[in-house]
């Protein structure tokens, strides 16, 4: 009931709590002398469902049969209306519509850790929309039964607060949950279990790793566990991997040797525990231990390449290049590279440690037979040295690969193809494809790239350090014993017309012809490999088509003669450059008048 109901009563039959779909009778009756002041016959009783008028009646009482009430709570209020006055609230009632509880399903109990307490969960089934009380009962040894009530609206979990101990691990316990409300009750099926079934161990803790003699092959993982743990699962992976290695161990007693870890790798380790081979559940995974394995001496050998440059009649410059070992080969932090240069006949040797670079340049005499050995060192030792005899890589013309071509292959890739050399192709032991950005000055500081290819291959896809709109000088070497032959070509992965034409910096007269000199187009404006230059000229103030001369592009060339100009005629000259994609805009214009005599 609501309010004080001084003026009358509202009664509900059969009950304030009804089953969904049931009918209720609501009666509103006035107490004696509580009607309208003058004419009791003028009493008008009105029944409201929430704020909506559903029935009215003149007199001392009103009866209303109500059906179709929704799940939940519905408020009915009875009011009295008299002539010339506001409606007066008489009384009211709440009706609660719901259903009897369904049978609780999937009752399961768990004790987290040997020192934890028993807690059970279940599925309530559909909402009853009524106050429903759940009672959880746990029966077991010594004829004991523990009970706990839950009065939350949505109750599907209860913790008994009692700790089961392993004194008799095979003893049976039975849990049952009963739901009760005003419309009925229902009990779950009993759930029977033993201590071993429901105790879920705490995850292992205090995980440590030890490497005997700082060696990855002697590695032991240590941890602490609850006393009754019989089984452990270990999982571990390199920190940059998504795949776990799994190991199951029995009676590990908090330690296990790991034999397959890679050196100098950060690993993540986790452990889980279980009390029994086939009963109970695994613990959660422990917190992760992250640890780096120790270094081991490098394996594998460095990939070494070199370049020779003539300095003068007695000296040559040797530039050595090598690639970093892969992480799995380096097996640690490479502290330095050891380069040994030796003259093979005289036996003189020079050793140098290189840090922070993967190249080394030195000057040696042009006479003698020279060899180099390069190895990588970490804190545990050195890789096997890579030995190379320094030779003239392009000396053997018969070993030169034939028909070398370079074609763009998708984004930032160049496909290099060739034909084997004329000399017995079976003599080729390997091909080396080398590429570097083309710089007109032949700058030796430009990074060198290379890859090795098996003797039966006649193509290679180069993609490392390849940029769009840059021209690369590409060489293919065929190596056979102490001999080498090479062929070269220019190539780019992507090209367009150059952004500018060459800048003419001088025009000079020489024996009735002129020599035009120009500055190279800046590399960043070439937009790929240049194929030709064009020199245009026409008579000043003439509307005729210009004449032109096309010169094949050569890296070092920046002058060209023209001998078809008439003396004492003023000409305007300019230049353009072409790539496979098209012609550049004009370079600067220069005027020139040939002074010589006419033929």
């Amino acid at each position: 009931k609501i309010d004080a109901c001084k003026r009358g009563d509202v009664t509900v039959k059969p009950s304030h709590v009804i089953l969904l779909g049931s009918t209720v009778n609501i009666t509103c009756s006035l107490k004696p002398r509580q009607g309208c002041f003058h004419y009791s016959r003028r009493n008008k009783l009105i029944l409201y469902k929430f704020d909506r008028r559903i029935n009215f009646h003149h007199g001392h009482s009103l009866n209303s049969q109500v059906t179709g009430l929704p799940l939940g709570t519905t408020l009915f209020v009875c009011k009295l209306a008299c002539i010339n006055s506001d409606e007066i609230q008489i009384c009211g009632a709440e009706i609660f519509v719901g259903v009897a509880p369904e049978q609780p399903q999937n009752l399961s109990c768990i004790q987290k850790g040997e020192q934890g307490t028993v807690a059970c969960t279940w599925e309530r089934g559909r909402d009853t929309h009524l106050y429903t009380e759940y009672t959880l009962q746990l029966s077991g040894p010594k004829n004991l039964t523990w009970q706990k009530q839950c009065k939350d609206i949505y109750c599907d979990y209860l913790d008994f607060g009692i700790n089961l101990t392993p004194e008799s691990p095979e003893s049976n316990f039975t849990a049952k949950v009963t739901a009760v409300n005003s419309l009925g009750s229902s009990s779950s099926l009993p759930s029977t279990f033993t201590f071993l079934d429901i105790v879920r161990p705490l995850p292992p803790w205090d995980i440590r790793i030890k490497f005997q003699k700082a060696s990855v092959s002697r590695c032991t993982l240590y941890w602490r566990d609850e006393g009754l743990v019989l089984l452990n699962r270990l999982r571990y992976r390199p920190s940059n991997s998504r795949l776990w290695n799994m190991v199951n161990v029995t009676k590990a007693k908090g330690r296990h040797d790991l034999l397959d870890l890679k050196p100098f790798t950060e690993y993540e380790f986790q452990i889980s525990s279980k009390l029994h081979l086939y009963k109970g559940s695994w613990s959660d995974w422990s917190e992760s231990l992250r640890a780096q394995t120790p270094e081991e001496e490098p394996t594998g050998m460095l990939d070494v390449w070199y370049m020779k440059r003539h300095i003068d009649y007695s000296r040559q410059q040797i530039s050595l290049f090598w690639k970093n070992l892969s992480v799995s080969e380096a097996r640690g932090k490479i502290l330095h590279y050891q380069v040994t240069l030796q003259e093979l006949t005289g036996g003189k040797a020079m050793t140098q440690n290189i840090t922070g670079h993967t190249s080394w340049t030195t000057v040696i005499p042009r006479t003698g037979n020279w060899a180099v050995a390069v190895s990588a060192a970490n804190s545990k030792g050195s890789s096997l040295p890579t030995r190379i005899n320094i030779m003239n890589l392009c000396e053997a013309g018969l070993l030169a690969p034939r028909q070398v071509s370079a074609n763009s292959e998708g984004m930032d890739n160049i496909l290099v193809t060739w034909q084997p050399p004329r000399k017995d192709p079976s003599a080729v032991q390997e091909y080396v494809v080398e590429w570097r950005e083309l710089h007109p000055g032949g700058d030796t500081q430009v990074p060198l790239n290379w890859l090795r290819s098996r003797p039966y291959n006649v193509s290679a896809l180069i993609s490392e350090n390849i940029k769009s709109y840059i021209c690369y000088e590409i060489r293919v070497y065929a190596l056979s014993g102490d001999q080498g032959g090479c062929s070269s070509i220019l190539g780019n992965s992507k090209h367009k017309a150059p952004l500018s034409g060459p800048h003419i910096n001088a025009i000079t007269e020489e024996k009735g012809s002129i020599l035009i000199s120009w500055n190279s187009i800046p590399v960043q404006e070439q937009m790929g490999c240049l194929l030709h230059y064009r020199i245009y000229w026409k008579e000043r103030d003439s509307n005729s088509q210009p004449q032109l001369c096309e010169i094949p592009y050569r890296v070092s060339q920046n002058s060209h003669p023209i001998n078809s100009l008439q003396p004492r005629v003023t000409y305007v000259l300019w230049m353009t450059a072409l790539t496979a994609a098209g012609e550049s805009s004009h370079g600067n214009e220069r005027e020139f008048c040939l002074q010589g005599k006419a033929n």
């Epitope: 010594k142 009970q147 009530q149 209860l158 008994f160 009692i162």
Partner: nanobody
């Protein structure tokens, strides 16, 4: 240090009801398992009922259906409502507290703190 003081005992008629109270002083009451034991003259102390920190209850076969244990953590109180009292219920009733919530709460040696007891006499 926890101190337990029982009250509510007395002389009652057969079939009557009685409510015993146990007031606890000291910190951490809400985390203790509380129990009632009784000892009749010339007999061993026996378990009556227990309630865990989370409110789960159990009682002995003899008191099943007649006695109810409850607690009020806000007031640091434990109660034993005894209905349909019999002559055999005559004994000194003790309140006890333990931090161990084991399956079998009837083992008196697991209880750390005990009250002085309150006498309940059921006359026929």
């Amino acid at each position: 240090q926890v101190q337990l003081v029982e009250s509510g005992g007395g002389l009652v008629q057969l079939g009557d009801s009685l409510r015993l109270s146990c007031a606890a002083s000291g910190r951490g009451f809400s985390s203790w398992t509380m129990a009632w034991f009784r000892q009749a003259l010339g007999k061993r102390r026996e378990f009556v009922a227990a309630i865990t920190a989370t409110g789960a209850r159990t009682c002995s076969a003899e008191s099943e259906g007649r006695f109810t244990i409850s607690r009020d953590n806000a007031k640091n109180m434990v109660f034993l409502q005894m209905n349909s009292l019999k002559a055999e219920d005559t004994a000194v009733y003790y309140c006890a507290a333990t931090g161990i919530a084991s399956w079998d709460p009837g083992m008196a040696d697991k209880y750390t703190y005990w009250g002085q007891g309150t006498q309940v006499t059921v006359s026929s």
